[in-house]
Amino acid sequence: AWELTILHTNDVHSRLEQTSEDSSKCVNASRCMGGVARLFTKVQQIRRAEPNVLLLDAGDQYQGTIWFTVYKGAEVAHFMNALRYDAMALGNHEFDNGVEGLIEPLLKEAKFPILSANIKAKGPLASQISGLYLPYKVLPVGDEVVGIVGYTSKETPFLSNPGTNLVFEDEITALQPEVDKLKTLNVNKIIALGHSGFEMDKLIAQKVRGVDVVVGGHSNTFLYTGNPPSKEVPAGKYPFIVTSDDGRKVPVVQAYAFGKYLGYLKIEFDERGNVISSHGNPILLNSSIPEDPSIKADINKWRIKLDNYSTQELGKTIVYLDGSSQSCRFRECNMGNLICDAMINNNLRHTDEMFWNHVSMCILNGGGIRSPIDERNNGTITWENLAAVLPFGGTFDLVQLKGSTLKKAFEHSVHRYGQSTGEFLQVGGIHVVYDLSRKPGDRVVKLDVLCTKCRVPSYDPLKMDEVYKVILPNFLANGGDGFQMIKDELLRHDSGDQDINVVSTYISKMKVIYPAVEGRIKFSTGSH
């Protein structure tokens, strides 16, 4: 028997520095977790102790903190090289700055293979990107070889900016011939490494003949066997065992997100490359693991540029940006409108001639807006200003919801109106009218939404049975502020871009902003 140790990360999202337990900015260092310096300590410890070790990443290193905003992926290549990753799969967020923003900072600079079997380049891009990412790679490990085959969410064109010259094929259809090719090369130990979410990971384990292990990402799935060490609630045991259609037991793993855990899976193979056993658990990278001093010193060196960036002007406002709780928790506020407009703008993807865009709606809990920005400071808006407005380090995500769920969400928005509570929704692409004289749960008297399948966008009444795409904070997608109905009833959820980054990019693009209060949210009394 031959034993392989797979160390894996996914959805690190620019958390190069250690973070608090909830993966936001580290405040009390003695209680902080993750970060590449701490990860390196643990990886090196395992490499020294065990003979056959692979360090893999399942995508979405890009996007999530000011590190990515400033360094645009150069930081990913540099520190992944420093940690000696063996391979990485492309995630949807790796395309956030377009194909050029992937090629230049990452694909050209990585000292490790970057993989995806279901992304096919066409047109002029085909030769430009040829060889920079691969469908699979055969890696020598000790005296054996291991095949790693990559995959990426086929929803990427709706979630990021891959352009028109990359085709995202069905994962299973694309993976099978590549696995077959590995088999013909006498590679009998094959890992599928990819970024399509836990449900697809399980399907790959079930359907793709010849895949021995699946290492996934995208859904931030936390798996654990035994008592979990932190706040994350396991979605299943680690590894999650799937019985394939040809009767094999295939371990599937994922390691939550944000570099908080290091996935640790030990696989035993027989001489024919069959998995005999698999066991392990994610390792919580808490403060009991010291940060590696040389990586930490490098982080501190790279940090200097971030501090300078946060005080530079992004753009100007010529109006007061009212982000006060007195406004945003009670009525339409122009800061809410600005943020929602930025969220929609960030999700413009002209992928279908029938639609002017794939999504037109935004909702945003008023309690998530934490500060106004005064225009009397020469109108200057900095990253620092925006960090005061959006201090939680969240993301603006894409969900699919039924109209009936949206209606419940808007009822929840005003179910205890008047108490300055955070659930009051700011909106974009939505016109809502409330009648507060009616009883809670029945206060939404009009709810019109902006059409997407139209050449001239206009507002139509919400249809209860229709499925709508909505951009919202990850906080709401996860049921925060009492929006349990969103969490329970959402049909799809894809993580989006860092909240501050979305707004800062929009402001930089617009140069001068003047958001108004324009009647998106209205109140009526009596009959409507």
């Epitope: 230049e104 050209k108 000292k111 293979p113 030769s127 430009q128 040829s130 990412y133």
Partner: antibody, heavy 118, light 107 residues
Framework: QVQLQQPGTELVKPGASVKLSCKAS????????LYWVKQRPGQGLEWIGG????????NFNEKFKTKATLTVDKTSNTAYMQLSSLTSEDSAVYFC???????????WGAGTTVTVSS | DIKMTQSPSSMYASLGERVTIGCKAS??????LSWFQQKPGKSPKTLIY???RLVDGVPSRFSGSGSGQDYSLTISSLEYEDVGIYYC?????????FGAGTKLELK
């Protein structure tokens, strides 16, 4: 197939300059860094520097910073290295090589022999 | 700069013999090491990168190993066409640095 073509020889006088070329074919020129390596007669290999053809960004061995200038011409898919103030120490074979995926130096030119002589 | 020390500087070996060439870095180079073969009047040819990853088309009798500061190239069974000079290269840090070379000749 992927190739890097270099002229065979250059004979130059001391104190003069020479511009060596490395013409790429068989791949998209802007997609990979090109590095230059020096080899004195009967000696080992020495890294001079490299250039990213897509944006002209370069990095150098400090030792060659004042000696070598790296440029590219995207229209002709050619990288150039200009060597200035030549002395007999600069007599060597100069290779260009492509820095491939995962930093595998996967393609090499045949080298240009530079002879500095009056 | 990182100094790469190769050993031996030259060696003789018989056909079919197992040959090992060493390369020591002046500091940890994180396995970012390549091996090249050069024949007289020719350009170098990459055999191995990232310590142990064999370049496509290179015979499987070539293998690489090592970590930290110490690395080696092994030819499991020497063949006639393997004679030449072998160089190691570290690419962990700029400037990239080569070893001085090991001349391998037939006994």
């Amino acid at each position: 197939q992927v190739q890097l073509q270099q002229p065979g020889t250059e004979l130059v006088k001391p104190g003069a300059s020479v511009k060596l070329s490395c013409k790429a074919s068989g791949y998209t020129f802007t997609s990979y860094y090109l590095y230059w390596v020096k080899q004195r007669p009967g000696q080992g290999l020495e890294w001079i520097g490299g250039i990213n053809p897509s944006n002209g960004g370069s990095n150098f061995n400090e030792k060659f910073k004042t000696k070598a200038t790296l440029t590219v011409d995207k229209t002709s898919n050619t990288a150039y290295m200009q060597l200035s103030s030549l002395t007999s120490e600069d007599s060597a074979v100069y290779f260009c090589t492509r820095r491939g995926s995962s930093w595998n130096f996967d393609v090499w030119g045949a080298g240009t022999t530079v002879t500095v002589s009056s | 700069d990182i100094k790469m020390t190769q050993s031996p500087s030259s060696m003789y070996a018989s056909l079919g013999e197992r040959v090992t060439i060493g390369c020591k870095a002046s500091q940890d180079i994180n396995s970012y090491l390549s091996w090249f073969q050069q024949k007289p009047g020719k350009s170098p040819k990459t055999l191995i990168y990232r310590t142990n990853r064999l370049v496509d088309g290179v015979p499987s009798r070539f293998s690489g190993s090592g970590s930290g500061q110490d690395y080696s190239l092994t030819i499991s069974s020497l063949e006639y066409e393997d004679v030449g000079i072998y160089y190691c290269l570290q690419y962990d840090e700029f400037p990239l640095t080569f070893g001085a070379g090991t001349k391998l000749e037939l006994k």
